[in-house]
Interface confidence: low
């Protein structure tokens, strides 16, 4: 028997420095977790103690904090090289800055293979990107070889900016021939490493013949055997065992997100490459694990540029940006409109001639807007200003909801109106009329939404049974501020870009902004 230790991360999302327990900015260092300096300590400890170790990443290193905003992927290459990752799969967020934003800072700089079998380049890009990412890689580990085959969510064109010269194929269809190729090369230990979410990970384990282990990402799935060590609730045991169509037991793993845990899986193979046993658990990277001093020193050096960045001008406003709770928790506020407009703008993807865009709607809890921005400071808007408006370090995500769920959400928005509570919704691509003289649960008297399947966007009444795409904060997607109906009834959820980054990019693009209060949210009395 031959034993392999797989160490894995996924959806790190730019958390190079240690973070708080909820993966936001570290405040009380004695309680902080994760970060590459702490990860390196643990990885080195395991590498010294165990003979056959692979360190793998299942994608979405990009996007999530000011580190990515400033360094644009160079930080990912630098610190992943420093940690000596063995392989990485491409995630959807690796395309956030377009193909160029992937090629230059990461693909050309990484000293480890970057993989995806289901992304095919065409046209002029094919020669430019050739060899910079691979469908699979055979890695020598001790006296053996292990094949790693990569995959990426086929939804990436809707979630990021891969351009028109990359085709995202069905994962299972694309993986099978690559695995077969590995088999012909006498590679009998094969890991599928990819970024399509836990449901697809399980399907790959079930359907792709010859895959021994699946290491996934995208869905931020936390798996754990026994008592979990922090706040995350396990979606199942670690590893999650799937019985394949040809009768094999295939371990599937994922390690939550944000570098909070290091996935730790021990696999025992027989001489024919069959998995005999698999066990392990994610390791919580808490403050009991010291940060490696050399990596920490490097982090501190890279930080200097970040501190400068946060005070630089992104753009100007010529109007007061009203982000006060007195406005945003009671009525339409222009800060809410600005943020929602930025959220929609960030999700412009012309992927189908029938649609002007795949999504037109935004909702945003008023309680998530934490500060106004005064235009009388020469109109200057900085990252620091935006960090006061959006201090939670969240993301703006894409969900699919039925019209009936949206209706419930808007009823919840005003169910206790007048108490300055955070659930009052700011909107984009939506016109809502409330009648507060009616009883809670029956206060939405008009709800019109902007069409997507149209050449000239216009507002149509919400249809209860139709499925709509909506951009919203991850806080709402997770049921925050009492929006349990969103969490319970959403049909799909893909995590998006860092909130501040979305707004800062929009302001930089627009250069001068002047958002207005324009009748997106109205109040009426009596019959409508």
């Amino acid at each position: 028997a031959w034993e392999l230790t797989i160490l894995h991360t996924n959806d790190v999302h730019s958390r190079l420095e240690q973070t708080s327990e909820d993966s936001s900015k570290c405040v009380n260092a004695s309680r902080c977790m994760g970060g590459v300096a702490r990860l390196f300590t643990k990885v080195q400890q395991i590498r010294r103690a165990e003979p056959n170790v692979l360190l793998l990443d299942a994608g979405d290193q990009y996007q999530g904090t000011i580190w990515f905003t400033v360094y644009k992927g160079a930080e990912v290459a630098h610190f992943m090289n420093a940690l000596r990752y063995d392989a990485m799969a491409l995630g959807n967020h690796e395309f956030d800055n377009g193909v160029e934003g992937l090629i230059e800072p990461l693909l050309k700089e990484a000293k480890f293979p970057i993989l995806s079998a289901n992304i095919k380049a065409k046209g002029p890009l094919a020669s430019q990107i050739s060899g910079l990412y691979l469908p699979y890689k055979v890695l020598p580990v001790g006296d053996e070889v292990v094949g790693i085959v990569g995959y990426t969510s086929k939804e990436t064109p809707f979630l990021s900016n891969p351009g028109t010269n990359l085709v995202f194929e069905d994962e299972i269809t694309a993986l099978q021939p690559e695995v077969d190729k590995l088999k012909t090369l006498n590679v009998n230990k094969i890991i599928a490493l990819g970024h399509s979410g836990f449901e697809m990970d399980k399907l790959i384990a079930q359907k792709v013949r010859g895959v021994d282990v699946v290491v996934g990402g995208h869905s931020n799935t936390f798996l754990y055997t026994g008592n979990p060590p922090s706040k995350e609730v396990p979606a199942g045991k670690y590893p999650f065992i799937v019985t394949s169509d040809d009768g094999r037991k295939v371990p599937v793993v994922q390690a939550y997100a944000f570098g909070k845990y290091l996935g730790y899986l021990k696999i025992e193979f027989d001489e024919r490459g069959n998995v005999i046993s698999s066990h392990g658990n994610p390791i919580l990277l808490n403050s009991s694990i010291p940060e490696d001093p050399s990596i920490k020193a490097d982090i501190n050096k890279w930080r200097i540029k970040l501190d400068n960045y946060s005070t630089q001008e992104l753009g100007k406003t010529i109007v007061y940006l009203d982000g006060s709770s007195q406005s945003c928790r009671f009525r339409e506020c222009n800060m809410g409109n600005l943020i929602c407009d930025a959220m929609i703008n960030n999700n412009l993807r012309h992927t189908d001639e029938m649609f002007w865009n795949h999504v037109s709607m935004c909702i945003l809890n008023g309680g998530g807007i934490r500060s106004p921005i005064d235009e009388r400071n020469n109109g200057t808007i900085t990252w620091e200003n935006l960090a006061a408006v959006l201090p939670f370090g969240g993301t703006f995500d894409l969900v699919q909801l039925k019209g009936s769920t949206l209706k419930k959400a808007f009823e919840h928005s005003v169910h206790r109106y007048g108490q300055s509570t955070g659930e009052f919704l700011q909107v984009g691509g939506i016109h809502v009329v409330y009648d507060l003289s009616r009883k809670p649960g029956d206060r939405v008297v008009k709800l019109d939404v902007l069409c997507t399947k149209c050449r000239v966007p216009s507002y149509d009444p919400l249809k209860m049974d139709e499925v709509y795409k909506v951009i919203l904060p991850n806080f709402l997607a997770n049921g925050g501020d009492g929006f349990q109906m969103i969490k319970d009834e959403l049909l799909r959820h893909d995590s998006g870009d860092q909130d501040i980054n979305v707004v800062s990019t929009y302001i930089s693009k627009m250069k001068v902004i002047y958002p207005a209060v324009e009748g997106r949210i109205k109040f009426s009395t009596g019959s409508h």
């Epitope: 708080s20 327990e21 909820d22 936001s24 900015k25 405040v27 009380n28 260092a29 004695s30 309680r31 008592n227 979990p228 060590p229 922090s230 706040k231 919580l284 808490n286 403050s287 009991s288 934490r370 500060s371 960090a387 006061a388 408006v389 201090p391 939670f392 806080f475 925050g480």
Partner: antibody, heavy 122, light 111 residues
Framework: QVQLQQPGAELVKPGASVKMSCKAS????????ITWVKQRPGQGLEWIGD????????NYNEKFKTKATLTVDTSSSTAYMQLSSLTSEDSAVYYC???????????????WGQGTLVTVSS | DIVLTQSPASLAVSLGQRATISCRAS??????????MHWYQQKPGQPPKLLIY???NLESGVPTRFSGSGSGTDFTLNIHPVEEEDAATYYC?????????FGSGTKLEIK
């Protein structure tokens, strides 16, 4: 609803130890820090330390490092504080409290037990 | 450790008037858009009760006559209009860094 139940009183002799309990209900015990606070009669509040039940991770006020030991039993959702080498200075009401901080790291103490009155007397 | 200085130590306010309690920290307790300062009310024989968290956020179920403000090192708790049942001792507490200390308390008496 969230509740933290503490025994009303403990009478202990000088030099002895006491282990007081704090039984939590109405929320996920392993997901929130439990803080312990001391209040001497007619005096203010002193932060002793806290414990994260999910991992057993603890933080102590330097002043109480050798005096207090914080533990938890997750199976019964109970937090414990043991005070050792008791003197009259340790006579006080000891509160356990649940820290908030699910969506932000505010760590405000949103629910409190009724307190245990510890009297050190021979 | 961060020292929190509360003033006044006690005050007497007429029914319906405004009570203002101040809390000064020896070090900045604000960062990343948050002020890590909280206010509690304690009545004799009872445990403290959270009123305000993160400087200005009203805890659920607390009457709106209580409000908090401030950032950096200076924070204020306001009660207006004061009611009979507000007679109590009020404490500020920070959670910016360990250990999380409390202020010495302000006793409010209703005239």
């Amino acid at each position: 609803q969230v509740q933290l139940q503490q025994p009303g009183a403990e009478l202990v002799k000088p030099g002895a130890s006491v282990k007081m309990s704090c039984k939590a209900s109405g929320y996920t015990f392993t997901s929130y820090w439990i803080t312990w606070v001391k209040q001497r009669p007619g005096q203010g509040l002193e932060w002793i330390g806290d414990i994260y039940p999910g991992s057993g991770n603890t933080n102590y006020n330097e002043k109480f490092k050798t005096k207090a030991t914080l533990t938890v039993d997750t199976s019964s959702s109970t937090a414990y504080m043991q005070l050792s080498s008791l003197t009259s200075e340790d006579s006080a009401v000891y509160y356990c409290a649940k820290e908030g901080g699910l969506t932000t790291e505010d760590y405000a103490l949103d629910y409190w037990g009724q307190g245990t009155l510890v009297t050190v007397s021979s | 450790d961060i020292v929190l200085t509360q003033s006044p130590a006690s005050l007497a306010v007429s029914l319906g008037q405004r009570a203002t309690i101040s809390c000064r920290a020896s070090k900045n307790v604000s960062t990343s858009g948050y002020s890590y300062m909280h206010w509690y009310q304690q009545k004799p024989g009872q445990p403290p009760k959270l009123l305000i968290y993160l400087a200005s956020n009203l805890e659920s179920g607390v009457p709106t006559r209580f409000s908090g403000s401030g950032s950096g090192t200076d924070f204020t708790l306001n009660i207006h209009p004061v009611e009979e049942e507000d007679a109590a001792t009020y404490y500020c507490q920070h959670s910016r860094e360990l250990p999380f200390t409390f202020g010495s308390g302000t006793k409010l008496e209703i005239k």
